[in-house]
């Protein structure tokens, strides 16, 4: 299973100091799911890690980057079937002998605990309960992410009093 989808648009302006201010809406595109400050898109097919990376690019997004354990937990809470795995944007850099996120940063030791080998052609996937390494050529579903985009609310100020 996968998370219920279709609930993307949320007004997250927390600090309204004046009732005459026009709120800004942070919106996920249609079909994307909002999780905190990100929009996530879960694939409905399977691919090796490289293909997954490329496919997210076609959606002007990237494979999922996980900043900390809290974000990992939030994402895993969306996975309702323990048998399903998703590629994320982390793989092993042979030259630097370390796990490397696709944004160029390295995995810090207290971020995620990866079960499995740290070796050439290893990529990382998440399941409902864990984080694993696997050959990058393995076929899995994947998760794309993009940042929430700011959309000016065109509603008159009185409408949200």
């Amino acid at each position: 299973q996968k998370p219920s989808i279709g609930k993307c648009s949320v007004d997250i302006q927390q600090n309204r100091t004046k009732t005459t201010e026009r709120p800004d809406l942070l919106n996920c595109p249609i079909y994307w799911q909002q999780v905190q400050e990100k929009c996530l898109l879960f694939s409905h097919t399977v691919n090796p890690w490289n293909n997954s990376l490329a496919d997210c690019s076609t959606k002007e997004s990237s494979l999922l980057l996980i900043q900390d354990k809290d974000e990992l937990t939030r994402t895993q809470n969306l996975i309702h079937d323990k048998a399903i795995s998703f590629w994320i944007g982390l793989n092993f850099s042979l030259s630097e002998k370390n796990w490397k996120w696709i944004n160029g940063s390295f995995l810090s030791s207290n971020d995620l605990k990866i079960t499995g080998d740290a070796k050439e052609n290893s990529c990382v996937y998440i399941s409902q309960t864990s984080v694993y390494s696997e050959y990058c050529s393995t076929e899995m579903k994947w998760i794309c992410q993009k940042e929430l985009t700011l959309v000016r609310n065109k509603v008159s100020p009185d409408s949200w009093l």
Partner: antibody
Framework: QVQLVQSGAEVKKPGASVKVSCKAS????????MNWVRQAPGQGLEWMGL????????YYNQKFKDRVTMTRDTSISTAYMELSRLRSDDTAVYYC?????????????WGQGTTVTVSS | DIQLTQSPSFLSASVGDRVTITCKAS??????VVWYQQKPGKAPKLLID???IRHTGVPSRFSGSGSGTEFTLTISSLQPEDFADYFC?????????FGGGTKLEIK
């Protein structure tokens, strides 16, 4: 235009296997995931699994995982679904169906269906 | 598994009628619902995706609505070619499931 043409009707005995083919035309075969769905007489539709024709990667409905094999031959733009250890309740029309989008689970083109009858 | 219950199972109507078919999900599926039309002996044809988005080439008399657990397909003015079976599908989970279908017949 997009066309999915399936192989002809099959009659099989219980315990046998059946292999159904689905030839695609009118689009890039490797660009769209192929699914298999079946419809038993008087019953609803049941999703069986998918294959990514570009890579050969598969994902199956757990119900069929031990009996189904999905393959493809990109040189002839054809997907295959083989179901083994057939039982009488496998009697159904089997459809191939193209996934319309990598990120949504709808089927925008279907084959004409292949009737598989399992009878002793 | 998510169960989809369609109602009615059978529907008799006349050309020009407005008809509504309902699909109820056993749990929240967001808007990840699809509607198909199927004529006897033919393959299903995609009508609507994401609960309300008409597929390319589908006449405007077909419309879909709903979210969560209750969805409707409406045909605003029945045409002779609309008499067929209709069924819904959810893809909120990776185990795609389908409704039992609604047979739309000429009165």
């Amino acid at each position: 235009q997009v066309q999915l043409v399936q192989s002809g009707a099959e009659v099989k005995k219980p315990g046998a296997s059946v292999k159904v083919s689905c030839k695609a035309s009118g689009y890039s075969f490797t660009g769209y995931t192929m699914n298999w769905v079946r419809q038993a007489p008087g019953q609803g539709l049941e999703w069986m699994g998918l294959i990514n024709p570009n890579t050969g990667g598969t994902y199956y409905n757990q119900k069929f995982k031990d009996r189904v094999t999905m393959t493809r031959d990109t040189s002839i733009s054809t997907a295959y679904m083989e179901l083994s250890r057939l039982r009488s309740d496998d009697t159904a029309v089997y459809y191939c169906a193209r996934l319309g989008d990598n990120y949504r689970g709808y089927f925008d083109s279907w084959g004409q269906g292949t009737t598989v009858t399992v009878s002793s | 598994d998510i169960q989809l219950t369609q109602s009615p199972s059978f529907l008799s109507a006349s050309v020009g009628d407005r008809v509504t078919i309902t699909c109820k999900a056993s749990q929240d599926v967001g808007t990840a619902v699809v509607w198909y039309q199927q004529k006897p002996g033919k393959a299903p044809k995609l009508l609507i995706d994401w609960a309300s988005i008409r597929h390319t080439g589908v006449p405007s008399r077909f419309s879909g609505s709903g979210s969560g657990t209750e969805f409707t397909l409406t045909i605003s003015s029945l045409q002779p070619e609309d008499f067929a079976d209709y069924f819904c599908q959810q893809y909120s989970t990776y185990l795609y499931t389908f409704g039992g279908g609604t047979k739309l017949e000429i009165k």
